[in-house]
């Protein structure tokens, strides 16, 4: 365990990291669910999209999200890894031209319509915390992750490495 300062030092390079290619290295269409198997769903309401975390009925179809994966280079002076350090970043798009965005001021996760190149708020560092789960860390705010709060997605500050396995920031990806 390396405590609060360790997590921030470990991820501080996110502020300066650059996406090494404008094209994703791979893309994956998947449904997104929580550690407790609740589905992440998207609904168009009053010309804007809302994001929900809910239990689906047995035969209800899950919403799909296009995950686009990008390589991002650590600046060598930050990572301590020379030119070697790389991170895997992801953008999440549930429908054409809309992407999940981190709103760090409101601690919220929102769907915004935008054109490429996407803003930094649409990029999340992918973490494997658990054998079959992933977590999404804000590129613009190291130590802050997409999480579940009151049946909605929210931004959750994780202040120590022990809390990185907390269930509310763990998500499952599935083709079904």
């Amino acid at each position: 365990a390396f405590g609060i300062s360790g997590v921030q030092k470990y991820t501080r390079a996110l502020h300066d990291s650059s996406i090494t290619g404008i094209s994703p290295i791979t893309e994956y269409l998947a449904s997104l669910s929580t550690y407790n198997d609740q589905s992440i769903t998207f609904a168009l309401e009053d010309e804007s999209y809302e994001i929900y975390v809910e239990d689906l009925k047995k035969d209800e179809k899950k919403d799909k999200v296009l995950l686009s994966y990008y390589e991002s280079q650590h600046p060598s002076n930050e990572s301590g890894d020379g030119v070697d350090g790389k991170m895997l970043m992801v953008t999440l798009s549930p429908t054409k031209d809309f992407w999940l965005h981190a709103n760090n001021k409101e601690h919220s996760v929102e769907l915004h319509k935008c054109e490429k190149p996407l803003p930094d708020q649409a990029f999340f560092v992918l973490h494997n915390m658990h054998s079959n789960c992933v977590s999404f860390e804000c590129k613009t705010d190291p130590g802050v992750f997409i999480g579940v709060k009151d049946n909605h997605l929210a931004l959750i500050k994780v202040d120590s490495s022990e809390n990185l396995c907390t269930e509310n920031i763990l998500f499952k990806l599935s083709e079904t």
Partner: antibody
Framework: EVQLVESGGGLVQPGGSLRLSCAAS????????MYWVRQGPGKGLEGVSG????????YYTDSVKGRFTISRDNSKNTLFLQMNSLRAEDTAVYFC???????????????WGQGTLVTVSS | DIQMTQSPSSVSVSVGDRVTITCRAS???SSWLAWYQLKPGKAPKL??????SLQSGVPSRFSGSGSGTDFTLTISGLQPEDFAVYYC?????????FGGGTKVEIK
Amino acid sequence: EVQLVESGGGLVQPGGSLRLSCAASGFTLRSYVMYWVRQGPGKGLEGVSGISGSSGGTYYTDSVKGRFTISRDNSKNTLFLQMNSLRAEDTAVYFCARSVYSTTWYGGFQHWGQGTLVTVSS
Amino acid sequence: DIQMTQSPSSVSVSVGDRVTITCRASQVISSWLAWYQLKPGKAPKLLIYAASSLQSGVPSRFSGSGSGTDFTLTISGLQPEDFAVYYCQQTNSFPLTFGGGTKVEIK
């Protein structure tokens, strides 16, 4: 330059214990997924155990669960594999490896040590 | 656990030939597959990651393709230094499992 150097291998009797070390240099160990892989005589590669950089979560293949323990010492930038209740089928060259990406194992393993030989025999 | 089935187990070829090795996963692994080269007494060398991304420093005669469950490693224009054993590895979820290996031998 990234370097991984394994040590601690040797001859041990069935039921015995060994502790393997992997000294890392040129990068911060805790920032990456680290992985132990073995190759038995005349056999293929087999993943043994991994540890997540971000959370420190640990993972084991079924055949070593309850017998092997992976850990790391961040201050010494060193990875360990404690092997107890060793069996003849654990005889292999053991490699440590570092992930391509920090925070995820999705990209596989880019840097490898030269390996250390563990022989379990009476 | 995800099983990885690699074929062929061995292939005899000449310098300059094109070699194709296939790997099949027992369940969908998206594009999370890596290919390694292993020579006796040496550490494994990463060739391809994320199914088709060429690792830095690896010659462009190596290429990878596929997604889902079926993947291919192609060596076009085999060089003398390419005779080795090649392994696929699913990097989707732990335990990260390897294929049985393909030995590329001189004809």
